[in-house]
């Protein structure tokens, strides 16, 4: 229904709290470079702006959209063509093309140091001595580093960070109990973020159709009672929300989200056995556990799927007359049987059944023809499945460092000319599918693995889009998200590609890696690692080991010396000159 | 839960006309597609026609095409089945039947409907 006021609506609906959060989250989203200090003056004033809107919805601007009044008030800030370039020339657009200009000036790698945790007894003191200042700050410090960040969700995470602390910091140990259960909340953080900006990914290059069959998978997968029906509702809820939220509409999505929970918990009985725990928790968390709620039990009694859609008939007159619909049952019918495929995994079948009946409906004997299509899905199943197998063998040989190193090597044998830190970030997150899926039961290990490296190769894909460099890697960017990560799956050693010169510079390096976390050495370790492959593509497994064997003992024996520096500086050239002897 | 009442046969001349009704409740019922089933004395249970939940898309079995119309009113929640140019073979026990929350006759056969009406009995004789 319309509102006199869009955002007194929005700040009624949401409460104080969450409105300035998701305020806060929008502006940072919006201008990277901002201090946290001139982004809360400007939450401050939106949300005075918003009660007095709440009031009397017919005050002076109270109308005005909300896109309208956020980008009014980007657009005062001074200096902001100093500090942002181009995207000042968004200001001389009117909506809905100004918010449009701000969305594509955002940027996924914004040039901003790592984000440094405080030590755990500064952390606890700046959090006790003003809460939500600290909360404040990380919001803006998460938001700028990632700009389609899920805004409702960060909520969730400020809520969690702030629990973390209001817990730890009464301990005698802080640090002992934070850094684990911080840990924790980051980790599941940043998938968060690699996997909503593959959503919006989605949503931008392919669409709302491509978006909701997606949702449509996801949601028969997690509720297989509910009906076909019940499914479409949900999806296209979650479409809206995603759409929202990815074009900046954060107060919108973030409102309907808290909407959809309450529908799915008022509706339980048509959607899932599984949801009431989730339905006793707070707004955040509800809609938090909703999101990650278990499948629930697949009924006993489904027919076959060859009945509805290959044994019927009149299969091409469903197809003919009401083809969306008719591909929407068959996509809802294969994923609630199969919790244990990828999203991926079940689209592509999906697209292989409409390949399929666009082909057979348009000959003389259709039946015939789409009858054997179920056993054509066979090496569709079996592509991914060997992709588990293998990698989760070679996880569990390697442990997690290895694994990211020999993911590293094959990628950067793939896409050489990808820059090296671009090329070490999607190894080490690629890497870590081993420690996320390979140890989960069987029947978890597909939709696990398969979805979440679709999630990080999304992100490779989008940081190359802003610098192409590699034919291959656009090639497999530009087709059908579903296809990503069989295509990166099939790329091969980069044959065009002419091998880097040696520069020794490259290979050099001094006693402050000595001091570094474990971490940050791994990485110094891994830049090597990929520089050495750009300079051999050809390298054998045996000899990039042999190199980065004596590297490691070099490195080790460098930072246990009396005089660190001497070490380095007189044991660095005999190990570039090994080095290049061993790659010869 | 769906639910579903026949309503409207009756004794009937070959060659004449009848109606019936299937009055249906339940969840999302606008969108899920209705079927009629008719079953003759001694033969299994047979698909007569069939139409879409919120999609505009019928089905027809090939002994009734041209004869029956198959329509629904969604205001009123019903189903109807126009069958004129009755035969003998037409005699039967007609029943309408739903898969819920399906919007498209995807299949026929009848053991994969779980919700039916009581049925309604339809003789054609003179």
């Known amino acids: 229904e319309a509102h006199k006021s869009e955002i007194a609506h929005r700040f009624k609906d949401l409460g104080e709290q969450h409105f300035k959060g998701l305020v806060l989250i929008a502006f940072s989203q919006y201008l990277q470079k901002c201090p946290y200090e001139e982004h809360i003056k400007l939450v401050q004033e939106v949300t005075d702006f918003a009660k007095t809107c709440v009031a009397d919805e017919n005050a002076e601007n109270c109308d005005k959209s909300i896109h309208t009044l956020f980008g009014d008030k980007l657009c005062a800030i001074p200096k902001l063509r100093d500090n942002y370039g181009e995207l000042a020339d968004c200001c001389a657009k009117q909506e809905p093309e100004r918010n449009e200009c701000f969305l594509q000036h955002k940027d996924d790698n914004p040039n901003l140091p790592p984000f440094q945790r405080p030590e755990a007894e500064a952390m606890c003191t700046s959090f006790q001595e003003n809460p939500t200042s600290f909360l404040g700050h990380y919001l803006h410090e998460v938001a700028r580093r990632h700009p389609y960040f899920y805004a409702p969700e960060l909520l969730y995470y400020a809520e969690k960070y702030n629990e973390v602390l209001t817990q730890c910091c009464t301990e005698s140990d802080k640090a002992a109990c934070l850094t684990p259960k911080l840990d924790a909340v980051k980790e599941k953080a940043l998938v968060a973020a690699v996997r909503q900006r593959m959503k919006c990914s989605s949503m931008q290059r392919f669409g709302e159709r491509a978006f909701k069959a997606w949702a449509v998978a996801r949601m028969s997968q997690r509720f297989p009672n509910a009906e076909f029906a019940e499914i479409t509702k949900l999806a296209t809820d979650v479409t809206k929300i995603n759409k929202e939220c990815c074009h900046g509409d954060l107060l919108e999505c973030a409102d309907d989200r808290a909407e959809l929970a309450k529908y799915m918990c008022e509706n339980q009985a048509t959607i899932s056995s599984k949801l009431q725990a989730c339905c006793d928790k707070p707004v955040l968390q509800k809609s938090q556990c909703l999101a990650e709620i278990e499948h629930d039990n697949i009924p006993a009694d489904l027919p076959s799927i060859a009945a509805d859609f290959v044994e019927d008939k009149e299969v091409c007159k469903n197809y003919a007359e009401a083809k969306d619909v008719f591909l929407g049952t068959f996509l809802y019918e294969y994923s609630r049987r199969h919790p244990d495929y990828s999203v991926s995994l079940l689209l592509r079948l999906a697209k292989k059944y409409e390949a399929t009946l666009e082909k057979c409906c348009a000959e003389g004997d259709p039946p015939a023809c789409y009858g054997t299509v179920l056993a054509e899905f066979q090496p569709l199943v079996e592509e991914p499945k060997n992709l588990v197998k293998t990698n989760c063998e070679l996880y569990e040989k390697l442990g997690e460092y290895g694994f990211q190193n020999a993911v590293l090597v094959r990628y950067t044998q793939k896409a050489p000319q990808v820059s090296t830190p671009t090329l070490v970030e999607a190894a080490r997150n690629l890497g870590r599918v081993g420690t996320k899926c390979c140890t989960l039961p069987e029947a978890q290990r597909l939709p696990c693995v398969e979805d979440y490296l679709s999630a990080i190769l999304n992100r490779l894909c989008v940081l190359h889009e802003k610098t192409p460099v590699s034919e291959k890697v656009t090639k497999c960017c530009s087709g059908s998200l579903v296809e990503r990560r069989p295509c990166f799956s099939a790329l091969t050693v980069d044959e065009t590609y002419v091998p880097k010169e040696f520069k020794a510079e490259t290979f050099t390096f001094h006693s402050d890696i000595c001091t570094l976390p474990d971490k940050e050495k791994q990485i110094k370790k891994q830049t090597a690692l990929a520089e050495l492959v750009k300079h051999k593509p050809k390298a054998t497994e045996d000899q990039l080991k042999t190199v980065m064997g004596d590297f490691a003992q070099f490195v080790d024996k460098c930072c246990k010396a009396a005089d660190k520096d001497n070490c380095f500086a007189t044991e660095g050239p005999n190990l570039v000159a090994r080095s290049k002897e061993a790659l010869a | 839960e769906v639910q579903l009442l026949e309503s409207g046969g009756g004794l009937v001349q070959p060659g004449g006309s009848l109606r019936l009704s299937c009055a249906a409740s339940?969840?999302?019922?606008?969108?899920?597609?209705v079927a009629w089933f008719r079953q003759a004395p001694g033969k299994e249970r047979e698909f007569v026609a069939g139409i879409g939940g919120g999609v505009d898309i019928t089905y027809y079995a090939d002994s009734v095409k041209g004869r029956f119309t198959i329509s629904r009113d969604n205001s009123k929640n019903t189903l109807y089945l126009q069958m004129n140019s009755l035969r003998p073979e037409d005699t039967a026990v007609y029943y309408c039947?739903?898969?819920?929350?399906?919007?498209?006759?995807?299949?026929?056969?009848?053991?994969?409907?779980?919700?039916w009406g009581q049925g309604t009995l339809v003789t054609v004789s003179s």
């Open positions: 339940g969840r999302y019922i606008d969108e899920t597609a």
């Open positions: 039947a739903a898969r819920p929350g399906q919007p498209l006759i995807t299949s026929k056969v009848a053991d994969l409907y779980p919700y």
